[in-house]
């Protein structure tokens, strides 16, 4: 019968011929009376056999990632009779892996959006690298992820590539971050190959800013001839949030005379001071009112940023009009 062991050849061998193993018949007594032949894909071009001894050699550099095994056929013939000594047999040459491929991030570019002020541990995104080396061959394709840029705001789980928040971030201070992740094979041991990817992480807005008046004092004037409903001036608060988080409502906090009202222009986010009752210069020539401003909608968990509404004082001077 045929005698052989499992055949392995390391990929990327640079030698002109590399001895893989021996194929022989147990009837072969070593007197060179048998001839061994190799058939099949790769026979003669990639692999050769010593016709006398049955020794098999690889004569080409192999790439496991291109082809990981070769199925060949062997024949042994009695030179004297020209007849087969053994039935033709199929055997396999496996190409064994070396760590010649670096991890690659195939889904880049990565981009993620996460709400500002998210707590530590919040999941941002998972990045995944793939390694063309053999996952069943040692640690050649076993990856470890690490953070090259992004501390102290982000962390990456070494085995999964899951990026999490490790420190609260405030959109109004910085609205986007570039995180650089490295994947290393060989679980980071010597001889490891690595690949990197960038992740753009954008912070979405939450309502963590209250509107605050630009000025602590406004001076307005109103003519005593002005009819009720007259707009006598505008006041303005700032809110550094965006979109609906910056929508605000103005209102009167103090007006003992109940002469004025404030309405909100939701297009411009300004407060418009309105005359609610007619004024009379001879009766009262100036007024002082206090206005306040609040966000339209604040979720309960963000109320700690909105403890006290901003107010402003408005001094209103009444202008005299000659009366008949």
């Amino acid at each position: 019968g045929w005698v052989w062991n499992q055949f392995f050849v390391p990929e990327e061998m640079n030698t002109t011929s590399h001895h893989i193993g021996q194929l022989r018949s147990d009837l072969d007594n070593g007197n060179n009376s048998f001839q061994y032949k190799l058939l099949g894909a790769g026979a003669g071009s990639t692999f050769i056999i010593d016709e006398r001894t049955g020794d098999i050699y690889a004569i080409q550099k192999l790439d496991r990632e291109e082809r990981s095994l070769y199925i060949l056929r062997a024949q042994v013939i009695d030179i004297a009779t020209g007849r087969a000594v053994e039935p033709e047999s199929e055997f396999v040459i496996k190409v064994s892996d070396i760590n010649d491929n670096e991890p690659k991030f195939l889904d880049e570019p990565y981009e993620a959006i996460v709400p500002e002020m998210s707590p530590e541990g919040t999941l941002v995104i998972q990045v995944t690298a793939s390694d063309a080396d053999d996952p069943s061959s040692g640690n050649n394709a076993r990856l470890l992820y690490s953070l090259l840029q992004g501390q102290p705001y982000f962390s990456v789980e070494p085995t999964t590539g899951v990026i999490r928040i490790s420190s609260k971030m405030d959109r109004e201070l910085q609205d986007e971050y570039w995180v650089i992740i490295q994947a290393k094979d060989m679980i980071g041991q010597p001889g490891a190959l690595s690949g990197t990817t960038s992740v753009l992480i954008k912070l979405s807005d939450v309502n963590d800013n209250k509107p605050i008046f630009k000025e602590s004092l406004y001076r307005l004037t109103v003519s005593e001839s002005a009819p009720t409903g007259t707009s006598i001036g505008t006041i303005m608060a700032y809110d550094n949030d965006i979109g609906e988080n910056a929508e605000m409502d103005y209102s009167i906090e103090e007006d003992d005379s109940q002469t004025f009202d404030i309405i909100t222009n939701h297009e411009t986010q300004e407060g418009i001071v309105i005359l609610k009752k007619k004024v009379d210069f001879e009766h009262q020539n100036h007024y002082g009112i206090r206005a306040k401003v609040k966000n339209h909608h604040v979720p309960e968990q963000l109320m700690k940023y909105h403890t006290e509404a901003s107010t402003t004082f408005i001094k209103i001077q009444v202008e005299d009009v000659d009366e008949p």
């Epitope: 109004e172 201070l173 800013n209 605050i212 004092l217 700032y238 700690k304 940023y305 901003s310 107010t311």
Partner: antibody
């Protein structure tokens, strides 16, 4: 790393002028407003002036209004404080400090997150 | 606009220190706090009443209500001995408190 470095301090006579500089590195200078803050020997911090990231707005403390001018050159990553008509009470360590907050935010709610090491100005005859 | 701080506060190691800052309707504004050690530049420790800048331990906390803002340092350490300044914003100008010297006994 993120850094502000002041220079230009020294001893000057009352009524004379001095120009302080503040060189920025490690961040995008043109995205940040910058303040000048001073501290007289043994005293507390006193705000002097601020300039917006694009130079479009400048505000001053009443004590220096009309005498000091804040300016910036974003192409050189440098902030300046031109101090004229100097008085003895202007003697102090002058710090430049970055206004925290992205462009588009207003007010000074987020504090001053990066400070220089300071440069000393002494006004004395 | 004026902000008033006590000139000095003393605390034993491991105890809680509270430094106040008062101003008219201060609770309506946002307050920042700075730490300054001798010969050094100030460091921002709290902004917007109660938020931490990166790298500041959560032993430092802030609150602001009515006319008073408070900086609280829990589990005070010897390294916390410094001058502390509050800062607010009013009508386009910046205002600092007079500063409080924190002594860790």
């Amino acid at each position: 790393q993120v850094q502000l470095v002041e220079s230009g301090g020294g001893v000057v006579q009352p009524g004379r002028s001095l120009r302080l500089s503040c060189a920025a590195s490690g961040f995008t200078f043109s995205r940040y407003g910058i303040h000048w803050v001073r501290q007289a020997p043994g005293k507390g911090l006193e705000w002097v002036a601020v300039i917006w990231y694009d130079g479009s707005n400048k505000y001053y403390a009443d004590s220096v209004k009309g005498r000091f001018t804040i300016s910036r050159d974003n192409s050189k990553n440098t902030l300046y404080l031109q101090m004229n008509s100097l008085r003895a009470e202007d003697s102090a360590v002058y710090y430049c400090a970055r206004r925290a907050g992205i462009p588009g935010t207003t007010g000074y709610y987020y504090g001053m997150d990066v400070w220089g090491q300071g440069t000393t100005v002494t006004v004395s005859s | 606009y004026e902000l008033t701080q006590p000139p000095s506060v003393s605390v034993s190691p491991g105890q809680t220190a509270s430094i106040t800052c008062s101003g008219d309707r201060l609770g309506e504004k946002y307050v920042s706090w700075y730490q300054q050690k001798p010969g050094q530049s100030p460091i921002l420790v709290i902004y917007q009443d109660n938020k931490w800048p990166s790298g500041i331990p959560e032993r430092f906390s802030g609150s602001n209500s009515g006319n008073t803002a408070t900086l609280t340092i829990s589990g005070t350490q010897a390294m916390d001995e410094a001058d502390y300044y509050c800062q607010a914003w009013d009508s386009s100008t910046v205002v600092f408190g007079g500063g409080t010297k924190l002594t860790v006994l």
